[in-house]
Protein backbone atom coordinates (compact mmCIF):
# COMPACT_ATOMS: atom_id res chain seq x y z
CA UNK A 1 0.00 0.00 0.00
CA UNK A 2 1.05 3.63 -0.49
CA UNK A 3 2.19 6.16 2.09
CA UNK A 4 -0.94 8.23 1.43
CA UNK A 5 -3.12 5.31 2.54
CA UNK A 6 -1.23 5.24 5.84
CA UNK A 7 -2.12 8.84 6.39
CA UNK A 8 -5.93 8.97 6.75
CA UNK A 9 -6.15 12.46 8.20
CA UNK A 10 -7.87 15.74 7.36
CA UNK A 11 -5.34 18.27 5.98
CA UNK A 12 -7.56 21.27 6.72
CA UNK A 13 -8.93 20.29 10.13
CA UNK A 14 -7.05 18.49 12.87
CA UNK A 15 -10.19 18.49 15.06
CA UNK A 16 -11.65 15.49 13.24
CA UNK A 17 -11.87 11.74 13.53
CA UNK A 18 -10.94 10.03 10.26
CA UNK A 19 -11.23 6.45 9.06
CA UNK A 20 -10.88 4.72 5.67
CA UNK A 21 -14.55 3.74 5.54
CA UNK A 22 -15.62 5.95 2.64
CA UNK A 23 -16.47 4.59 -0.83
CA UNK A 24 -13.65 2.36 -2.08
CA UNK A 25 -11.79 2.62 1.22
CA UNK A 26 -11.47 6.38 0.86
CA UNK A 27 -10.54 8.40 3.93
CA UNK A 28 -13.61 10.00 5.51
CA UNK A 29 -13.50 12.56 8.32
CA UNK A 30 -16.05 13.79 10.84
CA UNK A 31 -15.81 16.91 13.00
CA UNK A 32 -15.48 16.44 16.73
CA UNK A 33 -18.46 17.69 18.72
CA UNK A 34 -20.99 17.61 15.88
CA UNK A 35 -20.03 14.35 14.12
CA UNK A 36 -20.71 16.05 10.79
CA UNK A 37 -18.79 14.88 7.72
CA UNK A 38 -16.33 17.52 6.52
CA UNK A 39 -14.74 18.22 3.14
CA UNK A 40 -11.01 18.05 3.85
CA UNK A 41 -10.05 19.73 0.58
CA UNK A 42 -11.33 23.07 1.90
CA UNK A 43 -11.79 24.95 5.17
CA UNK A 44 -14.26 23.68 7.75
CA UNK A 45 -16.90 26.20 8.79
CA UNK A 46 -16.19 28.32 11.85
CA UNK A 47 -19.37 27.05 13.52
CA UNK A 48 -18.23 23.42 13.36
CA UNK A 49 -14.74 24.41 14.49
CA UNK A 50 -16.08 26.26 17.53
CA UNK A 51 -18.29 23.29 18.36
CA UNK A 52 -15.29 20.96 18.08
CA UNK A 53 -13.20 23.28 20.21
CA UNK A 54 -15.83 23.31 22.95
CA UNK A 55 -16.05 19.52 22.88
CA UNK A 56 -12.28 19.09 23.15
CA UNK A 57 -10.63 18.78 26.56
CA UNK A 58 -10.11 22.24 28.14
CA UNK A 59 -6.83 23.62 27.79
CA UNK A 60 -2.80 60.95 5.26
CA UNK A 61 -3.28 57.85 6.39
CA UNK A 62 -4.04 54.82 4.33
CA UNK A 63 -5.18 52.72 7.27
CA UNK A 64 -8.91 52.05 7.49
CA UNK A 65 -10.99 53.41 10.33
CA UNK A 66 -13.58 50.75 11.25
CA UNK A 67 -17.13 51.96 10.73
CA UNK A 68 -19.38 52.77 13.69
CA UNK A 69 -21.25 49.55 12.93
CA UNK A 70 -18.15 47.31 13.05
CA UNK A 71 -18.35 44.45 15.52
CA UNK A 72 -15.50 42.99 17.56
CA UNK A 73 -15.86 39.49 19.01
CA UNK A 74 -15.90 40.36 22.72
CA UNK A 75 -17.98 37.38 23.83
CA UNK A 76 -15.28 34.87 22.94
CA UNK A 77 -15.91 31.14 22.97
CA UNK A 78 -19.31 29.50 23.20
CA UNK A 79 -20.81 26.20 22.10
CA UNK A 80 -22.80 27.21 19.01
CA UNK A 81 -25.80 25.70 17.26
CA UNK A 82 -24.95 24.94 13.63
CA UNK A 83 -27.37 24.20 10.79
CA UNK A 84 -27.07 21.05 8.61
CA UNK A 85 -24.64 22.90 6.30
CA UNK A 86 -22.42 23.81 9.25
CA UNK A 87 -23.41 27.49 9.32
CA UNK A 88 -24.31 29.35 12.48
CA UNK A 89 -28.00 29.36 13.32
CA UNK A 90 -29.22 32.96 13.51
CA UNK A 91 -30.29 32.53 17.13
CA UNK A 92 -27.91 31.17 19.73
CA UNK A 93 -28.84 30.33 23.31
CA UNK A 94 -26.87 29.15 26.32
CA UNK A 95 -27.84 26.56 28.93
CA UNK A 96 -29.57 29.19 31.05
CA UNK A 97 -31.99 30.14 28.24
CA UNK A 98 -30.24 33.41 27.49
CA UNK A 99 -30.44 34.01 23.73
CA UNK A 100 -28.96 36.40 21.18
CA UNK A 101 -28.70 36.85 17.42
CA UNK A 102 -25.44 36.32 15.58
CA UNK A 103 -24.08 37.15 12.14
CA UNK A 104 -22.60 34.67 9.68
CA UNK A 105 -19.28 34.61 11.58
CA UNK A 106 -21.03 33.81 14.85
CA UNK A 107 -20.48 37.19 16.51
CA UNK A 108 -23.33 38.55 18.62
CA UNK A 109 -25.17 41.43 16.89
CA UNK A 110 -28.06 42.09 19.33
CA UNK A 111 -28.55 42.50 23.05
CA UNK A 112 -29.04 39.28 24.96
CA UNK A 113 -32.63 38.25 25.62
CA UNK A 114 -34.69 35.26 26.62
CA UNK A 115 -36.21 32.37 24.65
CA UNK A 116 -38.78 34.73 23.13
CA UNK A 117 -36.06 36.57 21.20
CA UNK A 118 -36.52 36.26 17.44
CA UNK A 119 -33.74 36.29 14.88
CA UNK A 120 -35.48 36.30 11.52
CA UNK A 121 -32.44 35.67 9.34
CA UNK A 122 -28.73 34.99 9.49
CA UNK A 123 -27.23 38.35 8.59
CA UNK A 124 -24.16 38.08 6.40
CA UNK A 125 -20.82 39.58 7.43
CA UNK A 126 -19.68 41.01 4.09
CA UNK A 127 -16.60 42.99 5.15
CA UNK A 128 -13.86 41.87 7.55
CA UNK A 129 -10.99 44.11 8.58
CA UNK A 130 -8.00 42.27 10.05
CA UNK A 131 -5.75 44.68 11.92
CA UNK A 132 -2.25 43.38 12.73
CA UNK A 133 0.85 44.77 14.37
CA UNK A 134 4.06 43.00 13.41
CA UNK A 135 7.10 42.57 15.61
CA UNK A 136 10.01 44.95 15.05
CA UNK A 137 12.19 44.16 12.03
CA UNK A 138 15.43 45.61 10.69
CA UNK A 139 13.41 47.79 8.33
CA UNK A 140 9.88 48.13 7.03
CA UNK A 141 8.59 45.46 4.68
CA UNK A 142 8.25 46.48 1.05
CA UNK A 143 4.53 47.21 0.68
CA UNK A 144 4.11 45.49 -2.68
CA UNK A 145 6.02 42.39 -1.48
CA UNK A 146 3.89 42.27 1.67
CA UNK A 147 0.69 42.74 -0.34
CA UNK A 148 1.64 39.94 -2.76
CA UNK A 149 2.64 37.50 0.00
CA UNK A 150 -0.54 38.04 2.04
CA UNK A 151 -2.72 37.63 -1.04
CA UNK A 152 -0.83 34.45 -1.88
CA UNK A 153 -1.25 33.21 1.70
CA UNK A 154 -5.03 33.62 1.57
CA UNK A 155 -5.18 31.99 -1.87
CA UNK A 156 -2.91 29.02 -1.21
CA UNK A 157 -3.29 28.28 2.48
CA UNK A 158 -6.92 29.26 3.05
CA UNK A 159 -8.14 28.62 -0.51
CA UNK A 160 -9.84 32.01 -0.63
CA UNK A 161 -10.46 33.37 -4.12
CA UNK A 162 -8.20 36.41 -4.74
CA UNK A 163 -11.15 38.64 -5.62
CA UNK A 164 -12.27 38.51 -1.96
CA UNK A 165 -9.03 40.07 -0.68
CA UNK A 166 -10.06 43.67 -1.29
CA UNK A 167 -6.93 45.43 -0.03
CA UNK A 168 -3.77 45.20 2.04
CA UNK A 169 -2.74 48.40 3.82
CA UNK A 170 0.61 48.94 5.53
CA UNK A 171 1.96 51.62 7.82
CA UNK A 172 4.80 50.09 9.79
CA UNK A 173 4.18 48.26 12.08
CA UNK A 174 0.44 48.07 11.30
CA UNK A 175 -0.92 45.82 8.57
CA UNK A 176 -4.58 45.77 7.62
CA UNK A 177 -6.16 43.12 5.44
CA UNK A 178 -9.63 43.82 4.06
CA UNK A 179 -11.80 40.89 3.04
CA UNK A 180 -15.07 41.59 1.20
CA UNK A 181 -17.67 39.08 0.05
CA UNK A 182 -21.29 39.94 -0.61
CA UNK A 183 -23.97 37.26 -0.71
CA UNK A 184 -24.32 37.75 -4.46
CA UNK A 185 -20.56 37.29 -5.02
CA UNK A 186 -20.18 34.00 -3.13
CA UNK A 187 -20.57 31.05 -5.46
CA UNK A 188 -20.99 27.40 -4.47
CA UNK A 189 -17.63 26.05 -3.38
CA UNK A 190 -16.17 29.45 -2.52
CA UNK A 191 -14.48 29.66 0.87
CA UNK A 192 -16.31 32.08 3.17
CA UNK A 193 -14.32 35.12 4.27
CA UNK A 194 -15.41 34.46 7.87
CA UNK A 195 -13.90 30.99 7.80
CA UNK A 196 -10.67 32.23 6.20
CA UNK A 197 -10.38 35.01 8.81
CA UNK A 198 -10.93 32.50 11.63
CA UNK A 199 -8.24 30.13 10.34
CA UNK A 200 -5.89 33.11 9.95
CA UNK A 201 -6.66 34.32 13.49
CA UNK A 202 -5.89 30.88 14.92
CA UNK A 203 -2.70 30.65 12.85
CA UNK A 204 -1.50 34.02 14.15
CA UNK A 205 -2.18 32.87 17.73
CA UNK A 206 -0.04 29.79 17.14
CA UNK A 207 -3.09 27.51 17.22
CA UNK A 208 -3.05 26.14 13.68
CA UNK A 209 -6.14 24.18 12.69
CA UNK A 210 -4.32 22.41 9.87
CA UNK A 211 -3.20 18.81 10.23
CA UNK A 212 0.01 18.03 12.12
CA UNK A 213 1.97 19.73 14.85
CA UNK A 214 3.34 22.50 12.66
CA UNK A 215 2.23 26.10 12.45
CA UNK A 216 2.17 29.07 10.13
CA UNK A 217 5.48 29.94 8.45
CA UNK A 218 4.96 33.33 6.82
CA UNK A 219 7.86 35.22 5.27
CA UNK A 220 8.16 38.25 3.05
CA UNK A 221 11.18 37.92 0.74
CA UNK A 222 12.60 35.42 3.23
CA UNK A 223 12.10 37.71 6.25
CA UNK A 224 9.76 36.16 8.87
CA UNK A 225 6.57 38.11 9.46
CA UNK A 226 5.72 37.72 13.13
CA UNK A 227 2.55 39.24 14.51
CA UNK A 228 2.29 40.48 18.08
CA UNK A 229 -1.28 41.83 18.08
CA UNK A 230 -4.45 41.10 16.13
CA UNK A 231 -7.82 42.85 16.08
CA UNK A 232 -10.63 41.76 13.78
CA UNK A 233 -13.61 43.93 12.90
CA UNK A 234 -16.75 42.50 11.31
CA UNK A 235 -19.19 44.53 9.21
CA UNK A 236 -22.60 43.10 8.44
CA UNK A 237 -24.85 43.71 5.44
CA UNK A 238 -27.46 44.97 7.92
CA UNK A 239 -26.16 47.07 10.86
CA UNK A 240 -26.36 45.41 14.29
CA UNK A 241 -29.17 46.21 16.73
CA UNK A 242 -27.89 47.10 20.17
CA UNK A 243 -29.65 49.23 22.76
CA UNK A 244 -28.28 52.69 23.63
CA UNK A 245 -27.47 51.35 27.10
CA UNK A 246 -24.71 49.14 25.63
CA UNK A 247 -23.37 51.92 23.43
CA UNK A 248 -22.86 54.27 26.38
CA UNK A 249 -21.44 51.62 28.72
Amino acid sequence: HTAAQDNCTCPTNKMTVCSPDGPGGRCQCRALGSGMAVDCSTLTSKCLLLKARMSAPKNARTLVRPSEHALVDNDGLYDPDCDPEGRFKARQCNQTSVCWCVNSVGVRRTDKGDLSLRCDELVRTHHILIDLRHRPTAGAFNHSDLDAELRRLFRERYRLHPKFVAAVHYEQPTIQIELRQNTSQKAAGDVDIGDAAYYFERDIKGESLFQGRGGLDLRVRGEPLQVERTLIYYLDEIPPKFSMKRLTA
Epitope: A3, A4, D6, N7, T9, P11, T12, R152, L153, E156, R157, S208, F210, Q211, G212, R213, G214, G215, L216, D217, L218, R219, G222
Partner: nanobody, 125 residues
Framework: QVQLQESGGGLVQPGGSLRLSCAAS????????MGWFRRAPGKGLEGVSV????????YYADSVKGRFIISRDNSKNTLYLQMNSLRPEDTAMYYC??????????????????WGQGTLVTVSS
Amino acid sequence: QVQLQESGGGLVQPGGSLRLSCAASGSTYSRRYMGWFRRAPGKGLEGVSVISPYGDSTYYADSVKGRFIISRDNSKNTLYLQMNSLRPEDTAMYYCAASWPYQTASLDAMDFTDWGQGTLVTVSS
Protein backbone atom coordinates in the same frame (compact mmCIF):
# COMPACT_ATOMS: atom_id res chain seq x y z
CA GLN B 1 -3.41 19.81 -4.02
CA VAL B 2 0.02 19.20 -5.43
CA GLN B 3 0.87 16.11 -7.50
CA LEU B 4 4.20 14.48 -6.69
CA GLN B 5 6.19 12.06 -8.85
CA GLU B 6 9.38 10.41 -7.63
CA SER B 7 12.15 9.05 -9.85
CA GLY B 8 15.77 7.91 -9.61
CA GLY B 9 15.38 4.70 -7.65
CA GLY B 10 17.10 1.50 -8.64
CA LEU B 11 19.59 -1.20 -7.69
CA VAL B 12 22.92 -0.03 -6.30
CA GLN B 13 25.84 -1.74 -4.55
CA PRO B 14 26.71 -1.02 -0.91
CA GLY B 15 28.84 2.13 -0.69
CA GLY B 16 27.32 3.47 -3.89
CA SER B 17 25.25 6.61 -4.54
CA LEU B 18 21.84 7.49 -5.96
CA ARG B 19 20.01 10.74 -6.51
CA LEU B 20 16.25 10.74 -6.11
CA SER B 21 14.10 13.45 -7.65
CA CYS B 22 10.53 14.48 -6.96
CA ALA B 23 8.71 16.58 -9.54
CA ALA B 24 5.81 18.62 -8.18
CA SER B 25 2.95 20.09 -10.16
CA GLY B 26 1.05 23.10 -8.87
CA SER B 27 1.91 26.69 -8.04
CA THR B 28 1.99 26.14 -4.27
CA TYR B 29 5.20 24.07 -4.24
CA SER B 30 7.52 26.89 -3.18
CA ARG B 31 5.50 27.60 -0.01
CA ARG B 32 5.49 24.02 1.26
CA TYR B 33 7.85 22.12 3.49
CA MET B 34 8.94 19.03 1.57
CA GLY B 35 10.12 15.70 2.88
CA TRP B 36 11.42 12.25 2.03
CA PHE B 37 10.05 9.20 3.82
CA ARG B 38 10.78 5.53 3.36
CA ARG B 39 9.27 2.16 4.13
CA ALA B 40 11.59 -0.85 4.37
CA PRO B 41 10.09 -4.29 3.69
CA GLY B 42 7.86 -5.28 6.60
CA LYS B 43 8.49 -2.00 8.45
CA GLY B 44 6.57 1.20 9.11
CA LEU B 45 6.96 4.59 7.46
CA GLU B 46 10.16 6.39 8.54
CA GLY B 47 10.98 10.07 8.13
CA VAL B 48 14.27 10.51 6.28
CA SER B 49 14.70 14.24 5.66
CA VAL B 50 12.72 17.50 5.54
CA ILE B 51 13.48 20.87 3.95
CA SER B 52 11.84 24.28 4.49
CA PRO B 53 10.32 26.31 1.62
CA TYR B 54 13.41 28.51 1.17
CA GLY B 55 15.83 25.64 1.76
CA ASP B 56 17.34 27.39 4.77
CA SER B 57 16.34 24.67 7.26
CA THR B 58 16.91 20.94 6.84
CA TYR B 59 16.28 17.99 9.13
CA TYR B 60 17.62 14.44 8.93
CA ALA B 61 16.95 11.15 10.65
CA ASP B 62 19.95 10.02 12.69
CA SER B 63 20.30 6.95 10.49
CA VAL B 64 21.12 9.04 7.38
CA LYS B 65 22.95 12.08 8.85
CA GLY B 66 26.21 12.76 7.06
CA ARG B 67 25.29 10.47 4.15
CA PHE B 68 22.11 11.97 2.63
CA ILE B 69 21.59 15.55 1.43
CA ILE B 70 18.17 17.04 0.75
CA SER B 71 17.81 20.03 -1.59
CA ARG B 72 15.19 21.75 -3.69
CA ASP B 73 14.94 23.92 -6.79
CA ASN B 74 11.83 26.10 -6.51
CA SER B 75 12.26 27.39 -10.06
CA LYS B 76 11.90 23.81 -11.31
CA ASN B 77 9.37 22.64 -8.68
CA THR B 78 11.71 19.77 -7.87
CA LEU B 79 12.92 18.14 -4.66
CA TYR B 80 16.10 16.05 -4.49
CA LEU B 81 17.70 13.50 -2.20
CA GLN B 82 21.38 12.76 -2.76
CA MET B 83 22.12 9.40 -1.13
CA ASN B 84 25.77 8.51 -0.58
CA SER B 85 27.53 5.60 1.18
CA LEU B 86 24.42 3.49 0.77
CA ARG B 87 23.90 0.48 3.03
CA PRO B 88 21.70 -2.60 2.69
CA GLU B 89 19.48 -1.22 5.48
CA ASP B 90 18.66 1.76 3.22
CA THR B 91 16.69 -0.62 0.99
CA ALA B 92 13.12 0.70 0.94
CA MET B 93 10.38 2.38 -1.03
CA TYR B 94 11.12 6.12 -0.90
CA TYR B 95 8.25 8.61 -0.89
CA CYS B 96 8.23 12.34 -1.48
CA ALA B 97 5.76 14.34 0.63
CA ALA B 98 4.50 17.94 0.88
CA SER B 99 3.05 19.85 3.81
CA TRP B 100 0.03 22.12 3.55
CA PRO B 101 1.11 25.53 2.14
CA TYR B 102 2.90 27.74 4.69
CA GLN B 103 2.77 24.95 7.31
CA THR B 104 5.92 24.01 9.17
CA ALA B 105 6.76 20.31 9.28
CA SER B 106 9.03 17.83 11.01
CA LEU B 107 10.02 14.21 10.32
CA ASP B 108 6.51 13.16 11.42
CA ALA B 109 4.35 11.85 8.55
CA MET B 110 1.33 13.49 10.21
CA ASP B 111 2.74 16.89 9.20
CA PHE B 112 2.41 16.06 5.49
CA THR B 113 -0.73 16.16 3.38
CA ASP B 114 0.32 15.17 -0.14
CA TRP B 115 2.28 12.08 -1.15
CA GLY B 116 3.90 10.58 -4.20
CA GLN B 117 3.57 6.94 -5.25
CA GLY B 118 7.16 6.09 -4.33
CA THR B 119 10.36 4.89 -5.99
CA LEU B 120 12.15 1.69 -4.97
CA VAL B 121 15.76 1.76 -3.81
CA THR B 122 17.56 -1.58 -3.44
CA VAL B 123 21.04 -1.73 -1.95
CA SER B 124 22.58 -5.13 -2.56
CA SER B 125 25.76 -6.73 -3.83
